[in-house]
């Protein structure tokens, strides 16, 4: 008789989920020689304890510590770049400019990216059929959980100027409700970080607008203000020029507004 | 079994770029760095750059950063070396090669090579 | 970038006697330092990964010794197919470096 298994809205773990979060542990070791003191099996079991086996909806911050400790890494605080909603674009600026750091770009938000996982209370088996849904089921599970963890300690690692790219595309640009608005901006701190520099980036060709002065940027502007952090934007009105002057940023071309 | 097998030799002239494939079988494309060695007639190796198949990110020896460009096909399985404004000091042969997960970050994975001539 | 110096650059050898290979990095390196060999016309093979763990299948007649700046690849009695250019490597800070090799010959 087959074992009666909960049905969760979400998709299921990502297929080949301990095979890839090992070998992405090992290529980013192999990238990264300074975390070649990362034993990856031990983040591999660390990761896999914060969820197996226990209650999808039930999973907390302190379940992922012992990831967290084994993930500790140190990145130049004044280097730091968030984003909402346009992760792709912020991952080519900095495969571009090297010396900037995207959470993804870390070990430990390397390792997740783009994946779902979470198993089933009181069995070690990994849930390859369906997990919850943030919305729909519940938000204290695994995937949702981790994000808020890493994400948490990555804003309060921030220094000096931070910045974070946001997609000009969306109805709201700066939503409250992402993991940029929900966490990152209440977690950086005032007495570390002197500026949040929001780069809005443009989608359309023609589109001149100042999106800086879009009501969820105001609102944006507010909340960083009221916890005694300045407040830039700039219009990035062409995303591919701009990638291109990060690359060359002699070419006569940058001088101009991008 | 692993495998990584390059593309055939090639004969190029002065200025010209010669683009150089490595197709690995046996394992999964996305789960190892790709690097890229070179070995002129008679001299040392030389690394040249790796990739990461899975997202596509680079990082080319200093030596090279202008003239090399590494990219991947993940649906081939295949990563790519492209060299550009070839001289005659390019004359070698070109190797992709990758780790092995638990063998420390040495190269125990080797294309066959490909001999690439430049020649004015 | 670190500058691997291998010594001698030639090692002319008898089959049956022992044979020291040196490397020397520039700075310090830790113990990220691989061994290979390489025959004429065929691709590098690797013999030792992190300055002395053997790879698998490699016979226990070659050993790796070292770590910080100072590396020795020995060979205990060798045999007719060891003679060939050996390389260390470097996988410690990028970019990667290789020495300049040094040719094991028949005496």
């Known amino acids: 008789v087959p074992r009666w298994r909960q049905q969760w809205s979400g998709p299921g773990t990502t297929k080949r989920f301990p095979e890839t979060v090992l070998a992405r542990c090992v290529k980013y070791t192999e990238i990264h020689p300074e975390m070649r003191h990362v034993d990856c099996q031990s983040v591999w079991d660390a990761f896999k304890g914060a969820f197996i086996s226990k209650h999808p909806c039930n999973i907390t911050e302190e379940d992922y510590q012992p990831l967290m400790k084994l993930g500790t890494q140190t990145v130049p605080c004044n280097k730091i770049l968030l984003w909402s909603r346009i992760k792709d674009l912020a991952h080519q600026f900095t495969q571009v400019q090297r010396d900037m750091f995207t959470l993804e770009d870390t070990l430990l938000g390397y390792l997740a990216d783009d994946l779902t996982w979470c198993g089933e209370f009181n069995t070690s088996k990994i849930n390859y059929q369906s997990c919850p849904d943030w919305r729909k089921d519940c938000s204290n599970n695994p995937v949702s959980v981790f994000w808020k963890t890493v994400s948490r300690r990555f804003a309060e690692a921030a220094c000096d100027v931070v910045h974070v790219m946001l997609n000009g595309s969306r109805s709201k640009i700066f939503d409250k409700n992402s993991t940029f608005g929900s966490v990152e901006v209440h977690n950086l701190q005032p007495e570390k970080v002197q500026t949040l520099e929001a780069w809005v980036i443009h989608g359309g060709r023609e589109d001149s607008r100042d999106l800086c002065q879009d009501p969820t940027i105001k609102e944006l502007e507010s909340i960083i203000s009221k916890r005694n952090i300045q407040f830039s934007c700039k219009n990035i009105y062409r995303p591919d020029k701009f990638l291109q002057c990060v690359k060359n940023p002699e070419d006569s071309s940058c001088t101009s507004e991008i | 079994q692993m495998q990584l097998v390059q593309s055939g030799a090639e004969v190029k002239k002065t200025g010209s770029s010669v683009k150089v494939s490595c197709k690995a079988s046996?394992?999964?494309?996305?789960?190892?760095?790709m690097n890229w060695v070179r070995q002129a007639p008679g001299q040392a190796l030389e690394w040249m750059g790796w990739?990461?198949?899975?997202?596509?990110?680079?990082d080319v020896a200093q030596k090279f950063q202008d003239r090399v460009t590494i990219t991947r096909d993940r649906s081939m399985s295949t990563a790519y070396m492209e060299l550009s404004s070839l001289r005659s000091e390019d004359t070698a042969m070109y190797y992709c090669?990758?780790?092995?997960?638990?063998?420390?970050?040495?190269?125990?994975?080797w294309g066959q090579g490909t001999t690439v001539t430049v020649s004015s | 970038e670190i500058v691997l110096t291998q010594s001698p650059a030639t090692l002319s050898l008898s089959p049956g006697e022992r044979a020291t290979l040196s490397c020397k990095a520039s700075?310090?390196?830790?113990?990220?330092v691989d061994w290979y060999q390489q025959k004429p016309g065929q691709a590098p093979r690797l013999l030792i990964y992190?300055?002395?763990n053997r790879y698998t299948g490699i016979p226990a007649r070659f050993s790796g010794s070292g770590s910080g700046r100072d590396f020795t690849l020995t060979i205990s009695s060798l045999e007719p197919e060891d003679f060939a250019v050996y390389y260390c490597?470097?996988?410690?800070?990028?970019?990667?470096?290789f020495g300049g090799g040094t040719k094991v010959e028949i005496k």
């Open positions: 090669a990758r780790t092995k997960y638990n063998s420390g970050y040495g190269f125990p994975y």
């Open positions: 046996g394992y999964t494309f996305t789960d190892s760095v």
């Open positions: 990739i990461d198949p899975e997202y596509g990110r680079t």
């Open positions: 700075q310090n390196v830790d113990s990220d």
């Open positions: 992190k300055a002395s």
């Open positions: 490597m470097q996988s410690n800070t990028h970019p990667r470096t």
